[in-house]
Interface confidence: low
């Protein structure tokens, strides 16, 4: 008769570092001792007629149990194989680019450490909850790629991978871990520069605007912006419309830059650099400063009128040009009372880069001079008629401008001048008319004839 | 830490040339302007120039200008002055130093290097 | 070129008194967006100038508050308040408003 030893469970299944009871059991009436065989850390629990109880500890990989016993003289077997599974200890998805190009492949790449039994094992790398790639986990550590072609839409997008272990054949489910997530930024940047809009030229100490636009810049708002001139950093302010991003800051020339210098506006974006430079040239352009040597002459007196400017200016007083740029125009004139509120001009004309800057600046020369009635304005007879409407058109002269009056010879009586008033023959006389100013008095005598009013 | 640190002395014969450097560290070199100055017993300090190491853009004390040369390496973070026919009156401690853009103080100065001309 | 002019050539002082060094330019170191750009430097012997003030009144990071400037235009002044050995040096005034930037000649603090 041919007698069995049986061994329980048979191929179980359990997690790693676990612990097992196995039981060895015969049906043969004159078995001897049954005796486990196998490298686990083993201890005997019980043993009785035809049967003995194990306890398995620490069970941390694959085994094959075998139980044995003697039984009339004839050695009988019985074995188990024990399937052992753990979950991985590391699942890592690797950094992704700082910043990624869109329309460029990149590959995404998962390490995982560990885990059992690999025939069991999956790894899945995922886009949000998408799966990009789904394989098996093969040698250790595992390592699992997939390129991605990078879109817009991917900016900001989270990538990670996970592990299934599939024990549901055993009746234990489905194990799963997931690595940290890492978000993706993708960015494009044309291969133009930008456009940067700034004056050719730049006088000293005045500003002007500058503007550097790019335009299919994504995301925009992440663009860095540098504008300078020559060493000097602009404060630039940063406008994002859509995929353009437009800078724009005030230039302010220095008098320590002078001479031909290089606007500069960068963009960075995604560790790339697009580069627009503009010359410039700083100039310096004071004046034309024109000068009286006395602002208020005396009539008679020698005034000089002078003009001067910056270095390599040419100026051109009243039409007179300098002798050379650089220099000073000047001219003198013996003050007359005709020179009273004359205005003296100056042009200043500069050379920068092939092109002619003008400038203008006047100034007036007041003469002083005595008062004077003009002689063509008042008529010394006049002829009026008794009741009518007239104007004595007296004009008086003189800087300071004077007073003018118009008083009857031996009376207090006054006429106005210069405004509308009825005539009558109380007017008829000889008048004083007298320009009286600071610098002295002028009199001409103006007799009014006036004909009585006839009723016939 | 901020540091600029100088190459060592030199002692070289009149008529040539030498080229002293100045390796920035702790900051990024390309934010800052590099300044080179002189210092000699009888003069003083003196200032010889400034060089911009992001575009490499250069400012001379005219009394340098064709004696002293700046350069820069930004891959190495280096600032180089080279000083040409060489004389005993170019004999002195130089030092590089940065400042923030214009125009303000020297912020961080080398530990100088020292140039004696003698045949 | 602005030139500036220190004085006193040599300042001794007894530790715990209060010094002051004056500095003059040539020309007004005021620059055209306001600012005036005149710093003090002090060179410890044997070592390189340090930065104590910054645009005439400005105390640099890690300079005590016994270092005090004022001035403008052209005529500037360091304050210490209390000298203590380790302010031993000489002091330079320097001015970046002008192309060159120019150094004054230098004060030197010593132990009467």
């Known amino acids: 008769q041919e007698f069995l030893l049986r061994v329980e469970p048979q191929n179980p299944v359990l997690s790693a570092g676990g612990s097992l009871f196995v039981n060895c059991s015969t049906d043969c009436p004159s078995s001897e001792k049954i005796a486990l065989e196998t490298s686990l850390s083993k201890a005997l629990v019980a043993s009785g007629m035809g049967w003995a109880a194990f306890n398995l500890s620490n069970v941390t990989g694959n085994s094959r149990i075998l139980c044995s016993v003697y039984c009339n003289g004839s050695q009988i077997t019985g074995s188990s194989n024990i399937t052992v599974y753990g979950l991985p200890e590391r699942v890592e998805l690797a950094p992704l680019p700082p910043w990624q190009p869109v329309g460029q492949n990149f590959t995404l790449r998962c390490q995982v450490e560990g885990g059992s039994p690999r025939t069991s094992l999956t790894v899945v790398l995922l886009r949000w909850e998408e799966e990009l790639s789904r394989q098996p986990a093969v040698e250790e550590p595992a390592e699992v790629t997939a390129t991605v072609l990078a879109s817009r839409d991917d900016h900001g997008a989270p990538f990670s991978c996970r592990t299934e272990l599939d024990m549901q054949p055993q009746g234990l489910g489905l194990f799963v871990n997931t690595s940290a997530p890492r978000q993706l930024r993708t960015f494009v940047l044309p291969v133009t520069p930008p456009r940067l809009v700034a004056p050719r030229f730049l006088e000293v100490e005045t500003s002007w605007p500058v503007d550097c636009t790019l335009d299919g810049l994504f995301p925009a708002s992440e663009a860095q912006v540098y504008l300078a001139l020559g060493d000097q950093m602009l404060n630039a302010t940063v406008m994002n419309h859509g995929d353009t991003l437009t800078a724009t800051a005030t230039a302010t020339a220095r008098a320590d830059q002078e001479g031909a210098r290089e606007i500069v506006c960068n963009v960075t974006l995604g560790g790339e650099r697009r580069e627009a430079r503009e010359n410039l040239t700083v100039f310096s352009f004071l004046g034309p400063i024109v000068n009286l040597s006395e602002p208020t002459a005396h009539e008679g007196s020698t005034v000089t009128v002078s003009c001067m400017a910056g270095a390599r200016v040419q100026v051109t007083l009243d039409g007179v040009p300098a002798a050379a740029p650089g220099q000073t125009a000047q001219l003198q004139l013996n003050a007359t009372e005709s020179d009273d509120g004359r205005s003296f001009f100056c042009s200043a004309t500069l050379e920068v880069d092939g092109e002619f800057l003008h400038r203008n600046s006047s100034v007036q020369l007041r003469v002083l001079y005595g008062p004077k009635i003009d002689r063509a304005t008042c008529p010394q007879h006049l002829k009026w008629k008794d009741k009518t409407r007239h104007v004595l058109q007296c004009q008086a002269r003189g800087n300071p401008y004077p007073e003018l009056r118009c008083l009857k010879e031996g009376s207090s009586r006054e006429v106005p001048v210069g405004i509308p008033f009825f005539v009558n023959v109380t007017h008829n006389g000889t008048y004083q008319c007298q320009a009286s100013s600071s610098r002295g008095k002028y009199t001409l005598v103006v007799v009014m004839d006036i004909e009585a009013f006839s009723s016939h | 830490e901020i540091q600029l640190q100088q190459t060592g002395p030199e002692l070289v014969k009149p008529g040539a040339s030498v080229k002293i450097s100045c390796k920035a560290s702790?900051?990024?070199?390309?934010?800052?302007?590099i300044l080179w100055v002189k210092q000699s017993h009888g003069k003083g300090l003196e200032w010889i120039g400034k060089?911009?190491?992001?575009?490499?853009?250069?400012t001379y004390n005219l009394k340098f200008k064709g004696k002293a040369t700046l350069t820069v390496d930004k891959s190495s973070s280096t600032a180089h002055m080279q000083l040409n026919s060489l004389t005993s009156e170019d004999s002195a401690v130089y030092y590089c130093?940065?400042?923030?853009?214009?125009?303000?103080?020297?912020?961080?100065w080398g530990q100088g290097t020292s140039v004696t001309v003698s045949s | 070129d602005a030139v500036m002019t220190q004085t006193p050539l040599s300042l001794p002082v007894s530790l715990g008194d209060q010094a002051s060094i004056s500095c003059r330019s040539s020309?007004?170191?005021?620059?055209?967006?306001?600012?005036?750009?005149l710093h003090w430097y002090l060179q410890k012997p044997g070592q390189s100038p340090q930065l104590l003030i910054y645009?005439?009144?400005n105390r640099f990071s890690g300079v005590p508050d016994r270092f005090s400037g004022s001035g403008s235009g052209t005529d500037f002044t360091l304050k210490l308040s209390r000298v203590e050995a380790e302010d031993l040096g000489v002091y330079f005034c320097?001015?970046?408003?002008?192309?060159?930037?120019?150094f004054g000649g230098g004060t030197k603090l010593e132990i009467k």
């Open positions: 320097s001015q970046s408003t002008h192309v060159p930037y120019t």
């Open positions: 645009k005439v009144s």
């Open positions: 060089i911009n190491p992001y575009f490499g853009t250069t």
């Open positions: 020309q007004s170191l005021v620059h055209s967006n306001g600012d005036t750009y």
């Open positions: 130093a940065r400042k923030e853009a214009y125009p303000d103080a020297m912020d961080y």
């Open positions: 702790g900051y990024s070199f390309t934010d800052c302007i």
